[in-house]
């Protein structure tokens, strides 16, 4: 049990284009072919103005036209829903495909892809109807980019609504060292193939992947919980064989000053195959990128029973420290080190006494000030539900 | 382009000090492990060091306290700094950069032209 | 300290010919293993890392093998370009000592 993490499968609220919560001062687009098509009138299920937003420019061959949707905080964002210009059936303009792309700070964008590495999404088939897409995996934004696509020079107009959560863990990145291939009687592929940062020299770092998606990973690594997807998808594993020093070391990057209370990392125990619970952790903290580590590293041995190979949540408890940065380093207990998720128990610190600026995710004004104050899901909202075997699934 | 230029090497006597450079261009040094690997004349590959990205140094057993890696990462270059040169030491020196394979491992995928430095009185 | 030994040191062949190297551990490290050729006057190229998986641009005649501490590169059928000196390494995230090397002449 992930006590604290979140549930991807409850993260799946309207974060408010429909119900008019995101006001309209936060969507905005490339281009309007008038006034009467602004973004404004990009809202699902809305027959203002002419009935959806539609660009100015065509969309083939270029697909540089986009609107976007600014969430003002971090959300993890599980689903999508799009329309055509429906205008009382007099609007015949709708997108058969578009891709997404997304930002947590407004600079960096990352192109949204499904597992398999596909970045277009299937659309919309006539004006009116509204068509739900998973998002698998989801994506951790601020900021949403919807580029609407054709095969052939054509009209296109769009009509959205993001359906998502609150992130609330504030993590905004992490860093390792990129995931390994294990040698089976098949190939275990242990990579974190949803990881939205950079790869470079053997680290993976500014972004977030598979530790962060909310999927926890099954007893046999092998498994996964995912249809079509490779041996190990839901791991991401090291072999101790690669680090002479006895451990793993990873970096964690949040958006505010913040106090920890827990980290927990679901680890796999196959020790038949390899995998075993780490030995022990030791995490340290600073407040900021250029700052010093502080003090020394709170330490936690783990007993991990050998004989239970089931797969298991492990809470590192970090007593409170203070920091925006975190540097763990996961001790082997044997062969390979394999995690599915990791995530934070932590409250926002108000400190007058900051020296450097606050991230800049945040939106303006102050920030709250306890995230357990917070609501993770809008009022008298169900999150809409995942149909087994849909297209949307 | 992507390369490595490294440079400093020359004839110098038995005993004395000499650094070498190693300049990057078309990607930052700090992101990566950085090797050191030299080759005596008509010799195999020796492995020398290596510095991590986070500024941990890694020696041979034989290079440990008379060799010693650094970087500055304003100037995008790796240094060799070699004392108490032997004539031993006389080689080409290659620095090198790790990249991992699509299986998480990792392999020198770039390497300097060498630079050549002959230790003799 | 890992200990990386190869055997042949030099091997006569003729193109065509299948080829076969082999590299020793002097304990296990898994699949923590890359191939490099080398020409004279040449830096090192990467072959392989992570026992099996080719560079990118290396042709598919060459294969590597093996885990633990007995390793294989094989060249299915050598050609003109394949005459050089070929080394292996244990390349972890720390030391990485080479293999001696394996020098591949023109039979």
């Known amino acids: 049990d992930m006590k604290g993490h979140f549930d991807p499968a409850k993260c799946r609220y309207a974060l408010g284009m429909q119900d008019r919560t995101i006001p309209d001062s936060d969507i905005s687009v490339s281009s309007s072919w008038s006034d009467s098509t602004a973004a404004r009138h990009s809202r699902l299920e809305s027959s203002d103005g002419d009935g959806a937003w539609c660009p100015a420019g065509p969309v083939f061959p270029k697909e540089e036209e986009y609107l976007q949707v600014d969430l003002r905080r971090l959300h993890l964002v599980a689903l999508v829903g799009t329309q055509g210009r429906h205008a009382g059936g007099l609007g015949k303009e709708f997108s058969r495909s578009y891709r997404l792309r997304y930002s947590r700070d407004g600079r960096r964008w990352m192109d949204w892809k499904d597992r398999w590495g596909q970045e277009v999404i299937s659309g919309n088939e006539d004006p009116g109807g509204v068509v739900l897409k998973d998002l698998g995996p989801p994506m951790v934004a601020r900021l949403v980019r919807f580029y609407p696509r054709a095969d052939r020079v054509m009209s296109v107009c769009l009509r959205v609504e993001l359906y998502g959560c609150l992130w609330r863990d504030g993590l905004l990145s992490y860093t390792a060292p990129v995931g390994q291939t294990m040698q089976l009687s098949e190939m275990v592929y242990l990579n974190d193939s949803t990881y939205d940062g950079y790869t470079a020299g053997g680290l993976q770092y500014g972004g977030l992947g598979q530790l962060a998606d909310g999927v926890v990973g099954l007893d046999d690594f092998r498994q996964s919980q995912e249809l079509r997807v490779w041996p190990g998808y839901d791991y991401v594993g090291w072999s101790n064989h690669s680090f002479p020093s006895g451990y793993v070391e990873m970096e964690f990057e949040f958006d505010r000053l913040r106090s920890f209370q827990t980290m927990q990392v679901h680890c796999n125990n196959m020790h038949t195959l390899g995998a075993r619970l780490p030995g022990g952790v030791e995490c340290r903290f600073k407040r900021g990128p250029a700052m010093a580590w502080e003090g020394e590293p709170v330490h936690h041995a783990l007993g991990g029973s050998l004989g239970d190979p089931r797969a298991r949540a492990i809470s590192v408890p970090l007593g409170g420290h203070v920091g925006r940065f975190l540097q763990c380093r996961f001790l082997f207990a044997g062969p390979w080190l394999l995690f599915s998720e990791i995530s934070f128990i932590s409250d926002v610190v108000n400190d007058s006494s900051d020296t450097f600026p606050p991230a800049p995710w945040w939106p303006p004004g102050p920030p709250p000030t306890n995230f357990s104050s917070l609501e993770l899901e809008p009022r008298g909202q169900q999150p809409v539900a995942k149909a087994e075997g849909s297209p949307t699934a | 382009q992507v390369q490595l230029v490294e440079s400093g090497g020359r004839v110098v006597q038995p005993g004395r000090s000499l650094r070498l450079s190693c300049t990057a261009s078309?990607?930052?040094?700090?992101?990566?492990?950085m090797l050191w690997v030299r080759q005596a004349p008509g010799k195999g590959l020796e492995w020398i060091g290596t510095?991590?990205?986070?500024?941990?140094?890694y020696y041979a057993s034989w290079a440990k306290g008379r060799f010693t890696i650094s970087r500055d990462n304003s100037k995008n270059t790796l240094y060799l700094q070699m004392n108490s040169l032997r004539a031993e030491d006389t080689a080409v020196y290659y620095c090198?950069?790790?990249?991992?394979?699509?299986?998480?491992?990792?392999?020198?995928?770039?390497w300097g032209q060498g630079t050549l430095v002959t230790v003799s009185s | 300290d890992i200990q990386m030994t190869q055997s042949p040191s030099s091997v006569s062949a003729s193109v065509g010919d299948r080829v076969t190297i082999t590299c020793q551990a002097s304990q296990s490290i898994g699949s923590v293993l890359a191939w490099y050729q080398q020409k004279p006057g040449k830096a090192p190229k990467l072959l392989i890392s992570?026992?099996?998986d080719l560079a990118s641009g290396v042709p598919s005649r060459f294969s590597g093998s093996g885990s633990g501490t007995d390793f294989t590169l094989t060249i299915s059928s050598l050609q003109p370009e394949d005459f050089a000196t070929y080394y292996c390494q244990y390349i972890p995230y720390g030391s990485s000592p080479f293999g001696g090397g394996t020098k591949v002449e023109i039979k």
């Open positions: 510095i991590s990205y986070g500024d941990t140094t």
């Open positions: 090198a950069r790790a990249d991992t394979g699509d299986n998480g491992y990792l392999g020198l995928q770039l």
């Open positions: 992570g026992v099996f």
């Open positions: 078309g990607f930052s040094l700090n992101r990566y492990y």
